[in-house]
């Protein structure tokens, strides 16, 4: 659980953050786990320990292994593990699998490549990027902040794509690399400020107590492949998960890409056995993308069961 | 040194309310997560609410959700548990807590408790 | 909602003994449970946390192992004052759970 996997090229630098997190204000030791010995926080020294942070600056391929990291508050210790691999350069273009970050996919009008880890380095823009080890050039090609900006994409444009940074510590600069696979979806598209197509806003659900009851969260964010789209339910202002009602729970529907292209998203809440108490609370169904955020509110209201019987007399 | 000290307990008929206030002293209040536990007499213990220190988001127990709120005021480093329709089986030691670590999305323990204040819910 | 079951309900031992209580999830909690102690008119006192580590100013005598969904506290040598109720909690998530307890009395 609090074990993470992080790996490197030798002679790049190397930052690795502690997986045990904690408040901002608790020490961090770090530990060689083979041999217990203390990594130390001395700047002078090739490895050495920032807080939360271990720099290999340059990494060597003789540092691979796993480090213990321990985080301690004024009353409570914690440790976490980072299981770390240096490997040696390679001497041709490819790219190894176990090199790679995770890919990501790309449309038209949606195409950021996100340089992986580069949030844990100190580094000044501007990134330099490569595909398939050949320099981007052309005005098609944008380094923008921490990401890659491709416009017009093609389906051309696939591939493995590596950022290269200069990592800089007391005035001292090394290289850091880091690469991904980009697949694109060949379809024209756009993203919008999401559109709430259900519930209605202020909606009324009536549900019967002691039944299952279930509620569609469903909005639409553009057409084609939508970057940061995401609906969720809120109880009272809660997530469901720090909610702690395990009759409440949600559930991803399908994507949906509906006759007139638009892309769409559903959340389905499912309140199993409802109970009173759960007519008093505030479900807000929520839909965000980069454009922004829109709130949509449900009440849930006592349906008295229809007594069958009289709807044939 | 940290100090936790519940107050408002006391007798209320069914379906009354109570306010019950927590007093915290020997630490940063405002950013850890605070707890309401709850002891029936003769029985264990059981979680009632947890409201964060960052956000202030709750959560509450199944047996107690839409009938007691859980908030907090930092300016006065006081918790506060507000109990409406009080029922017979809400009847128990009431105690606060400070769980002194957790992340977003995460739990920890709690490792100081107040003395506990008792509620008694009786016609 | 993770069920915490203690065993035994109670256990009657003698200064000196060992003393073994152990604590069953009804489904993982990876090493996110902890051990209190509770003695008659008094609140909680935290002893073990991530299932094995001694809480600030715990006697060495008190120790926990386990992981996933075993769980045991084990006191290698009773004193007097160790006589009371334990109580297991996970808080790998909402809602918090705690164990029925176990009574450690005199035998």
């Known amino acids: 659980k609090f074990s993470k996997q992080s790996w490197g090229l030798e002679n790049e630098a190397l930052i690795v953050r502690c997986p045990r997190q904690g408040k901002p204000s608790y020490t961090v030791d770090w530990y060689y786990s083979q041999t217990n010995k203390s990594i130390p926080t001395q700047e002078r020294n090739r490895v050495f320990a920032s807080g939360q942070l271990l720099k290999f600056l340059p990494a060597a391929v003789a540092d691979s292994g796993i480090y213990t990291c321990i985080v301690r508050s004024p009353t409570f210790n914690r440790t976490g593990y980072a299981n770390v691999t240096i490997y040696k350069k390679q001497s041709d273009c490819n790219v190894p699998d176990y090199l790679m970050y995770s890919t990501v996919s790309g449309s038209e009008k949606n195409s950021k490549i996100y340089c992986p880890t580069i949030d844990l380095y100190n580094w000044t823009a501007p990134l330099e990027w490569f595909k398939n080890c050949q320099a981007l050039q052309g005005s098609r090609y944008r380094a923008h902040k921490s990401f890659l900006v491709i416009d017009n994409v093609m389906t051309e444009d696939a591939g493995d794509y590596t950022c290269k940074f200069i990592h800089n510590e007391n005035g001292a600069n090394y290289s850091v690399t880091a690469t991904r696979s980009f697949t694109v979806k060949d379809e024209q598209g756009f993203s919008l400020f999401p559109v709430i197509g259900a519930p209605a806003q202020n909606e009324i659900k009536e549900v019967e107590i002691g039944k299952n009851a279930n509620l569609t969260c469903s909005a639409c964010f553009g057409k084609g492949t939508q970057f940061l789209a995401a609906v969720l339910w809120q109880l009272n202002g809660t997530k469901i998960t720090d909610f702690g009602e395990p009759r409440i729970q949600q559930e991803e529907g399908q994507n949906q890409s509906f006759s007139n292209g638009l892309a769409c998203l559903d959340m389905v809440l499912r309140i199993a056995d409802v109970k009173e108490e759960d007519l008093l609370l505030q479900y807000d169904c929520l839909a965000l993308n980069l454009h922004g955020l829109r709130r949509h509110t449900v009440r849930l209201s006592r349906k008295n069961p229809i007594d069958h019987h009289s709807i044939y007399c | 040194e940290v100090q936790l000290l519940e107050s408002g307990g006391g007798l209320v008929q069914p379906g009354g309310s109570l306010r019950l206030s927590c007093a915290a002293s020997?630490?940063?209040?405002?950013?850890?997560?605070m707890i309401w536990v709850r002891q029936a007499p003769g029985k264990g213990l059981e979680w009632v609410s947890t409201?964060?220190?960052?956000?202030?988001?709750?959560s509450y127990a199944d047996s107690v959700k839409g009938r007691f709120t859980i908030s907090r005021d930092n300016s006065k480093n006081t918790l506060y548990l507000q109990m409406n329709s009080l029922r017979a089986e809400d009847t128990a030691v009431y105690y606060c807590?400070?769980?002194?670590?957790?992340?977003?999305?995460?739990?920890?323990?709690?490792?100081?408790w107040g003395q506990g204040t008792l509620v008694t819910v009786s016609s | 909602e993770i069920v915490l079951t203690q065993s035994p309900a109670t256990l009657s031992l003698s200064p000196g003994e060992r003393a073994t209580l152990s604590c069953r999830a009804s489904q993982s909690v990876d090493d996110d449970l902890a051990w209190y102690q509770q003695k008659p008119g008094q609140a909680p006192r935290l002893l073990i946390y991530?299932?094995?580590n001694r809480a600030t100013g715990i006697p060495a005598r008190f120790s926990g192992s386990g992981s996933g969904t075993d769980f045991t506290l084990t006191i290698s040598s009773l004193e007097p004052e160790d006589f009371a109720v334990y109580y297991c909690?996970?808080?790998?998530?909402?809602?918090?759970?705690f164990g029925q307890g176990t009574k450690v009395e005199i035998k």
């Open positions: 807590a400070r769980d002194p670590w957790s992340t977003e999305g995460s739990f920890f323990v709690l490792d100081y």
């Open positions: 409201i964060r220190g960052e956000g202030g988001g709750t």
């Open positions: 991530d299932a094995s």
């Open positions: 909690q996970q808080y790998i998530t909402a809602p918090l759970t």
């Open positions: 020997g630490f940063t209040f405002s950013i850890y997560d």
